[in-house]
């Protein structure tokens, strides 16, 4: 996250980080507790998944296994629309006040609406600089309308931006998958965005969650 | 330091295939995509395709499809593109390069490998 | 697939000469062009990117500029060691990526 600020500690009980090993891969969301909801492109082979810490590489958080994924079978890698996917999580999380589910959205949230996105990924661009806490920011969606001024024929129908008005704050690497979260429900997957990051009015780019709860509903029923 | 170092000259004859590898140091590989770019004596940059070094998608260009194949050692960060059937027209010097960016799209390549002769003749 | 054509595909200059190269795309690509120097016997070496951003490291006397279909690099005025090959590329509609021509800059 670039321009962000600590998150308070515990507020975001539905973050997890996908390690590779021990190493950062993406962000995700617990949806259910055999379930995350991350970005299609963070696929990997398998995956370490740390829950219920606001520190990567905490010693005394949930680590679980995780060797399944499904990925939208829409995904492009031309256009990267449906960038979504679910990890499936080799044995349950124990649920607290530190490990909580999302709450996926009922509606699409309108143009406006302020949200936070969360993630350990770099504080810095080019060069990168990875925290130990998780970093939020405080974002507003934008219209598909403005967006497109950005990134023209680049935004597909299920992508959703984000961003302030002439702020350098946004995503960036290790981001990825991670969680934007607006009045208390999740909005979008951090997907991608112009780089070096953080270069005001170029908004970061989301994948919409409310067009797909159908999809992840389904999908976790399919694959119980 | 940040690099990327390509396998040595290769003379092989038509029909052959040839597999040219390209490592990586001095950053996260699985982070990035790599990409293969190739430049025959004299003429301009022809991009391959790419892979992505975590998941192992790929995205090869239309007139090499069927022939070219790009893989991944996550285990020592190295790249691999191997060309088969090859044709005196695949003389080259092949160039591994590293996309900028983050997520699910990149935009310009910021680091590339040294090159890697290959000649093909009879 | 987005074609690149660039002109000049060669010039001659002196040292001191202000240089233009441009780089047109068939269709528009927005503002994500980049520019790269290659010499002989070595890999391209990223200059410019976002049609305009100076890469890190690279002089301050090449700049480039456009957006859409048309765009141009500039040497402000023309040193011994830029004596190269210029590429444009486009990162927009990918893949594939497609290259222009290529543009020699030589000595007059």
């Known amino acids: 996250i670039i321009d962000g600020y600590k998150c308070k500690e515990g507020s975001h009980p539905w973050q997890v980080a996908l390690l590779k090993g021990n190493q950062l891969h993406c962000g995700g969301v617990l949806v259910d507790k055999y379930w995350v909801l991350t970005a299609a492109h963070c696929k990997m082979g398998q995956y370490q998944v740390q829950l219920g810490s606001d520190k990567i590489g905490d010693q005394s958080a949930q680590k679980i296994k995780a060797t399944k994924s499904f990925r939208h079978p829409g995904y492009s890698t031309k256009t990267h629309v449906n960038d979504i996917m679910l990890v499936r999580l080799d044995e349950p999380v124990k649920m607290s006040s530190k490990v909580e589910a999302v709450q996926l959205p009922e509606h699409c949230e309108p143009p406006g609406t302020s949200c936070t996105v969360s993630g350990w990924g770099t504080t810095t661009s080019p060069d990168v600089t990875f925290p130990s806490d998780l970093m939020c920011s405080d974002v507003k969606l934008i219209s598909s309308r403005e967006c497109k001024k950005v990134y023209k024929d680049l935004l597909g129908k299920t992508m959703l931006c984000a961003g302030i008005p002439d702020s350098k704050t946004n995503t960036c690497n290790g981001d990825s998958g991670g969680p934007l979260v607006c009045n208390d429900t999740l909005q979008g997957l951090v997907s991608w965005g112009t780089y070096p990051c953080g270069q005001p009015n170029d908004p970061g780019v989301y994948t919409q969650v409310c067009k797909y709860k159908r999809w992840v509903m389904e999908t976790m029923k399919t694959h119980r | 330091q940040v690099q990327l170092v390509q396998s040595g000259a290769e003379v092989k004859k038509p029909g052959a295939s040839v597999k040219v590898s390209c490592k990586a140091s001095g950053y996260t590989f699985t982070s990035e995509g790599i990409h293969w770019v190739r430049q025959a004596p004299g003429q301009g940059l022809e991009w391959m395709g790419s892979?992505?070094?975590?998941?192992?998608?790929?995205n090869y260009a239309q007139k090499l499809q069927g022939r070219v194949t790009m893989t991944t050692d996550t285990s020592t960060s190295t790249a691999y593109m191997e060309l088969r059937s090859l044709r005196s027209d695949d003389t080259a010097v092949y160039y591994c390069a590293r996309a900028a960016g983050y997520g699910a799209r990149h935009w310009y390549f910021d680091l590339w490998g040294q090159g890697t002769m290959v000649t093909v003749s009879s | 697939d987005i074609q690149m054509t660039q002109s000049p595909s060669s010039l001659s200059a002196s040292v001191g000469d202000r240089v233009t190269i441009t780089c047109r795309a068939s269709?528009?690509?927005?503002?994500?062009l980049n520019w790269y120097q290659q010499k002989p016997g070595k890999a391209p070496k990223l200059l410019i990117y976002?049609?305009?951003s100076l890469q890190s490291g690279v002089p301050s006397r090449f700049s480039g500029s456009g957006s859409g279909t048309d765009f141009t690099l500039t040497i402000s005025s023309l040193q011994p060691e830029d004596f190269a090959t210029y590429y444009c590329d486009q990162f927009y509609s990918t893949p594939p990526i497609t290259f222009g021509g290529g543009t020699k800059v030589e000595i007059k």
């Open positions: 892979i992505s070094a975590s998941s192992g998608d790929t």
């Open positions: 976002g049609a305009s």
């Open positions: 269709q528009s690509i927005s503002s994500y």
